[in-house]
């Protein structure tokens, strides 16, 4: 064996956001000819010595962080990046609204607001087709996601989730979808990016608001929060490669 073993990848199919009672498969992928795989749930004593974990029906206790590694001969690989498996539908859905409204002129501003009756301090906003959510810590039962200088790329279907930082892997059901329509522009398909844009967020300490824009690169903000990305899942309808904020 020459050189260190490469770390494996760990993905959740079809998604790492799993509604309660729905199936999900965690798959660890290393190089060909692996002798043994080990897939473990962090912060628990649960592990299994195989590459695939099949969950026929998602349960609360299965939510959490997973990672895997493999053995070749007497050598163990470095662990995979952690995969966060989230159970959704644990709590009632929040409501998602657009201010001033869901129809926006190109170049204008719009704020998406996710609101819940419960005391959740975390919110995640998803745009259909994007690989990652925009998460927003907020203390007042509501999260604001301003989108400044709207472009045609912001058109689409949005949903939000609410959850608690005390139980970060147990999420609400998704809000009803909100269709954001950007008027006054026409974009030809050839000018659209070939991949869904990555999300970039700037966090405002003063207002605890997340400003969301779109770019083809992911970079960290200048504040003490950083964006980390788990490996992108490929092929089949894989779940989002989730991006999140850590102090």
């Amino acid at each position: 064996q020459r050189g260190p073993l490469p770390k494996p990848s760990l993905q959740a199919l079809p998604s790492s956001l799993v509604p309660l009672e729905k199936p999900v498969t965690l798959r660890c992928q290393g190089p060909p000819g692996v002798d043994l795989y080990r897939l473990e749930k962090l912060s628990s004593s649960r592990y299994q010595d195989q590459a695939v974990l099949f969950i026929p029906a998602m349960k609360r206790h299965l939510a959490g962080r997973y990672r895997c590694s493999y053995q070749n001969g007497s050598l163990w690989s470095p662990p995979s990046d952690q995969l966060e498996l989230v159970a959704t539908g644990v709590f009632a859905k929040p409501s998602l609204s657009a201010q001033p409204g869901p129809a926006v002129s190109s170049g204008g501003d719009v704020t998406l607001q996710c609101q819940t009756r419960y005391g959740f301090d975390q919110f995640a906003l998803y745009k259909e087709g994007d690989p990652a959510p925009y998460k927003n810590p907020e203390r007042w039962y509501r999260a604001s996601f301003p989108i400044i200088t709207v472009t045609a790329a912001h058109s689409g279907t949005y949903r939000c989730y609410s959850f608690s930082s005390g139980d970060p892997y147990l999420w609400s059901a998704p809000s009803d979808p909100l269709e954001l329509m950007v008027t006054g522009t026409s974009v030809t398909p050839s000018r659209l990016p070939t991949e869904p844009p990555s999300s970039v967020a700037e966090f405002s300490e003063a207002t605890a608001e997340l400003t969301v824009s779109f770019t083809n690169k992911v970079f960290t903000t200048e504040t003490s929060r950083s964006i980390t990305t788990s490996p992108k899942e490929s092929d089949s309808p894989a779940g989002p490669a989730r991006q999140y904020y850590t102090k």
């Epitope: 729905k22 199936p23 498969t25 099949f54 026929p56 029906a57």
Partner: antibody, heavy 119, light 107 residues
């Protein structure tokens, strides 16, 4: 892989139906393997009833849940289904089938056993 | 519960023709869908699993497509042995439900 269903053939209303699925060519102790029961009234469509996984997790048709019990005998390669207090609406052909998690499908089926509920 | 709506309910076609049967799920089921063929007096037989994958021994004239909520089974160049009933079934959380079936008859 083969599966074969057996049952009483005829029952009277309010009796309990006991079905047995005997299989070979696979083991229900193998990770990701399950066995399910499906029924089909004559000339009608298919209806999933229940299934059981290698780890003894059991799932039931919501509408029939209170009347159904599925169990397994791994060492003898058998799965059982009981349906309490049968009625004429339970007259059907009953099939058992193997489930493999990878394909999420019923990949092998038995030949079926016919039940007639009549007074 | 997830409803599976299959169409058409019946279909007449001639040997050599191409036919398509569709199945619509009432919510997103990703690729958790299988197609079965059933001939008169026989048990169902798996054709396609995970929406697009042909089961072992199934002729290549059969193909499955779709994901999410819209699925289809296509049979190219129909053969005499292809006539019978076809069912779709979802596996995305219980209860697993079947479509109502499509009866494919010889014209």
């Amino acid at each position: 892989v083969t599966l074969k269903e057996s049952g009483p053939g005829i029952l009277q209303p309010s009796q309990t139906l006991s079905l047995t699925c005997s299989f070979s060519g696979f083991s229900l102790s193998t990770y990701g393997i399950g066995v399910g029961w499906i029924r089909q009234p004559s000339g009608k469509g298919l209806e999933w009833l229940a299934h059981i996984w290698w780890d003894d997790n059991k799932y039931y048709n919501t509408a029939l849940k209170s009347r159904l019990t599925i169990s397994k005998d791994t060492s003898n390669n058998q799965v059982f289904l009981k349906i309490a207090s049968v009625d004429t609406a339970d007259t059907a052909t009953y099939y058992c089938a193997r489930i493999h998690y990878y394909g999420s499908s019923l990949d092998y089926w038995g030949q079926g056993t016919t039940l007639t509920v009549s007074s | 519960d997830i409803q599976m709506t299959q169409s058409p309910a019946s279909l007449s076609a001639s040997v050599g023709e191409t036919v398509t049967i569709t199945c619509r799920a009432s919510e997103n089921i990703y690729s958790y869908l299988a197609w079965y063929q059933q001939k008169q007096g026989k048990s169902p037989h798996l054709l396609v699993y995970a929406a697009t994958n042909l089961a072992d021994g199934v002729p290549s004239r059969f193909s499955g497509s779709g994901s999410g909520t819209q699925f289809s089974l296509k049979i190219n160049s129909l053969q005499p042995e292809d006539f019978g009933s076809y069912y779709c079934q979802h596996f995305y959380g219980t209860p697993w439900t079947f479509g109502g079936g499509t009866k494919l008859e010889i014209k």
